[in-house]
């Protein structure tokens, strides 16, 4: 069942990096400066995307089958204790809001994540299983094409991806509680 799949996924990066409890306080001096959107809404130009109606089961399946492996590959060579989880999420839509923000919003110290394989797969799964999400990405895609094709993995990017692993883990946990 779902629990077995989840347990099988608990390799190093899923177990480490801040433990099972998440701080709900503000981001204290981490590399990524973004706002928390606990409502599950993503700012997209002049409007917000609401992740409430996504097919969470399908997204979870895509994550467990392939996205998680790409995230872990990206983190290879680092230890799960190297970074602390400073970003949290409280429910499934909120988790997707934070995942979207950390994956696709460039920051001064980590601007290249959107070109990574895990990011492309994350974009695809959101576009497929979140009604109307693809429409919000049409203009965003033009901007991304103009972005630099930098492939340098900085320590700050590793820290950001460790936060992503924590958010995805939390997303899975909120799903498991619903089973």
């Amino acid at each position: 069942g779902l629990n077995d799949i989840f347990e099988a996924q608990k390799i190093e990066w899923h177990e480490g990096g801040g433990g099972s409890d998440y701080k709900d306080d503000d981001d204290k001096g981490s590399s990524h400066h973004h706002h928390h959107h606990s409502s599950g809404l993503v700012p997209r130009g002049s409007h917000m995307y609401d992740f409430t109606n996504c097919d969470f089961q399908k997204i979870e399946a895509d994550y467990l089958r392939t996205i998680s492996k790409d995230l872990i590959t990206y983190m290879s060579g680092t230890k799960s204790t190297d970074f602390n989880n400073t970003v949290s999420c409280s429910n499934r839509p909120h988790c997707l809001t934070e995942i979207q923000s950390l994956t696709f919003n460039p920051t001064p110290r980590c601007a290249s994540l959107a070109k990574e394989m895990f990011a492309r797969k994350t974009k695809a799964t959101l576009a497929l299983w979140c009604p109307g999400y693809s429409e919000t990405q049409i203009n965003a895609t033009q901007a991304m094409k103009k972005a630099r094709k930098s492939k340098v993995t900085t320590n700050k990017c590793l820290e950001q991806v460790s936060q992503l692993l924590g958010l995805w883990r939390r997303f899975i946990r909120t799903l498991l509680k619903k089973q």
């Epitope: 895509d62 089958r65 492309r120 695809a124 497929l128 009604p131 693809s134 429409e135 895609t141």
Partner: antibody, heavy 120, light 107 residues
Framework: QVQLVQSGPEVKKPGSSVKVSCKAS????????MHWVRQRPGQDLEWMGT????????DYNQNFKGRATITADKSTSTAYMELSSLRSEDTAVYYC?????????????WGQGTLVTVSS | EIVLTQSPGTLSLSPGERATLSCRAS??????VHWYQQKPGEAPRLLIY???QSISGIPDRFSGSGSGTDFTLTISRLESEDFAVYYC?????????FGRGTKVEIK
């Protein structure tokens, strides 16, 4: 340029299966989902399902669930649609169509269609 | 599933005239509607995506508008090659669905 080339026409008996292929070229295969759409004689278009190579996953129209299987061979950039337990109402032209999954998000290129005739 | 209702079923017009085709969705689908043209014996061809986005290579006499539940495809001045069947399609959510088509025929 982008091309989707489908396999040739098929004549099948009721109760049998058919497997239609769609060979893609001119683009990165994994950047696009492959959808299958059918059109019965004189009828409108009906979405059957899709395979997403990037995520190794598929999704189906409930009307075809259990009878349709959509797969892909990434090494040859070829998608397949197999329909089992054929009946006369399955006589139709079957189209493959690509759709971007990280950009464009629309069926912007179509195969030429494969006519499948189900007759005893 | 989302049902798309196209009207009229048939539109009889002369070359040079303006054609207005309608597509109504059974629920709110934002702007996730695409328009295709199909001629006998051919595969559908994409004309407009996400309600109003134009496609390179498609003549600019084709334009789209609408959002929510009501969408329109307009052909400003019909050319002889425009007489065909036009379908709207939604990609808002699975299962993807098509309208039943509007046939634009020569009067």
């Amino acid at each position: 340029q982008v091309q989707l080339v489908q396999s040739g026409p098929e004549v099948k008996k009721p109760g049998s299966s058919v497997k239609v292929s769609c060979k893609a070229s001119g683009y990165i295969f994994t950047d696009y989902a492959m959808h299958w759409v059918r059109q019965r004689p004189g009828q409108d278009l009906e979405w059957m399902g899709t395979f997403i190579p990037l995520l190794d996953t598929s999704d189906y129209n409930q009307n075809f669930k259990g009878r349709a299987t959509i797969t892909a061979d990434k090494s040859t950039s070829t998608a397949y649609m197999e329909l089992s337990s054929l009946r006369s109402e399955d006589t139709a032209v079957y189209y493959c169509a690509r759709m971007g999954v990280t950009h464009s998000y629309v069926m912007d290129a179509w195969g030429q269609g494969t006519l499948v005739t189900v007759s005893s | 599933e989302i049902v798309l209702t196209q009207s009229p079923g048939t539109l009889s017009l002369s070359p040079g005239e303006r054609a207005t085709l309608s597509c109504r969705a059974s629920q709110h689908i934002s702007r996730s509607v695409h328009w295709y043209q199909q001629k006998p014996g051919e595969a559908p061809r994409l004309l407009i995506y996400f309600a109003s986005q134009s496609i390179s290579g498609i003549p600019d006499r084709f334009s789209g508008s609408g959002s929510g539940t009501d969408f329109t495809l307009t052909i400003s001045r019909l050319e002889s090659e425009d007489f065909a069947v036009y379908y709207c399609q939604q990609s808002y959510s699975f299962p993807y669905t098509f309208g039943r088509g509007t046939k634009v025929e020569i009067k």
